[in-house]
């Protein structure tokens, strides 16, 4: 793989997902991302933020919740909530704009 | 390695919804690590961002077409879509699926040439 | 909306030459997410350069990048005739994304 470029001081994180290549991982910011799939219960995914910060100011909708923070594991002990399920004309975006 | 590929018709009628569809192989759209973009190019033109989606289905697009623009994600098929609606010959281009990570739109879709024309 | 510049339009040089690719943004953008792409007619866009300076997997090492804050330079040591095409300047990493006008490399 190429290397990363660099990105200023890196926070550890707590990583968990499918995706993780160890129960850490280091980034610009610490992650928790709450998806609910159509049909299936939601799952909370943590790791580490290096692209798109404006993600994380988008407001939860009843699929997704993001949430970030900056210091040494800090998204070890978050739990997330979705929205309650909405009427369709209510339906928040998950445009994050 | 990860190839994507673009899918939908070629020709689309003017007033009608543009619809395209990037399957990504050799590679999870799952993963944190990446964003998947929309890229578009008109013939002789330069290149124009349209909008990126995260696996967690969370969306940005170019403010200059964000009323007309979705993008979707299915994780389970590996694919995200593209619908542009209310098209016009000017949306008459080229249209590009990129994977985007700290290194950049790092793999492209071949492209596919879309034209707008009753 | 970050504003790339990218100078000159087009540049004709030789074989063997130096060429001098320049990219100004309206505002300040991270090195660490600036990028330079080549593309060739009836191809799509190949990623040349990523964090200003770091060169993707496979690009030759003639090509390089430097700059910071708003001026950004992609300088091709010397030219081979497969890197006559058109450059773009890239800013990513946060929206909206923006692309350079791009800048066209001829052969004189």
């Known amino acids: 793989d190429p290397v990363k470029p660099s990105r200023g001081p890196l926070v550890t994180c707590t990583c968990e997902s499918p995706h993780c290549r160890g129960p850490t991982c280091q980034g610009a910011w610490c992650t928790v991302v709450l998806v609910r799939e159509e049909g299936r219960h939601p799952q909370e995914h943590r790791g580490c933020g290096n692209l798109h910060r404006e993600l994380c100011r988008g407001r939860p909708t009843e699929f997704v919740n993001h949430y970030c923070c900056d210091s040494h594991l800090c998204n070890r002990n978050v739990s997330l909530v979705l929205e309650a399920t909405q009427t369709p004309s209510e339906q928040p975006g998950t445009d994050s704009q | 390695q990860v190839q994507l590929q673009e899918s939908g018709p070629g020709l689309v009628k003017p007033s009608q919804t543009l619809s395209l569809t990037c399957t990504v192989s050799?590679?999870?759209?799952?993963?944190?690590?990446?964003?998947w973009n929309w890229i578009r190019q008109h013939p002789g033109k330069g290149l124009e961002w349209i909008g990126y989606?995260?696996?967690?289905?969370?969306?940005y697009y170019n403010p200059s077409l964000k009323s007309r623009v979705t993008i979707s994600v299915d994780t389970s098929k590996n694919q995200f879509s593209l619908k542009l609606s209310s098209v016009t010959a000017a949306d008459t281009a080229v249209y590009y699926c990129a994977r985007e990570s700290v290194a950049g739109f790092d793999y492209w879709g071949q492209g596919t040439l879309v034209t707008v024309s009753s | 909306e970050i504003v790339l510049t990218q100078s000159p339009g087009t540049l004709s040089l030789s074989p063997g030459e130096r060429a001098t690719l320049s990219c100004r943004a309206s505002?300040?953008?991270?090195?660490?997410?600036l990028a330079w792409y080549q593309q060739k007619p009836g191809q799509a866009p190949r990623l040349l350069i990523y964090g200003t300076s770091s060169r993707a997997t496979g690009i030759p090492d003639r090509f390089s990048g430097s700059g910071s804050g708003t001026d950004f330079t992609l300088t091709i040591s010397r030219l081979e005739p497969e890197d006559f095409a058109v450059y773009y300047c890239?800013?990513?990493?946060?929206?909206?994304?923006?692309f350079g006008q791009g800048t066209r490399l001829e052969i004189k």
């Open positions: 989606i995260y696996y967690s289905g969370s969306t």
């Open positions: 890239q800013q990513y990493g946060s929206s909206p994304i923006t």
């Open positions: 505002q300040s953008v991270s090195s660490s997410y």
């Open positions: 050799g590679g999870s759209i799952s993963s944190g690590e990446y964003y």
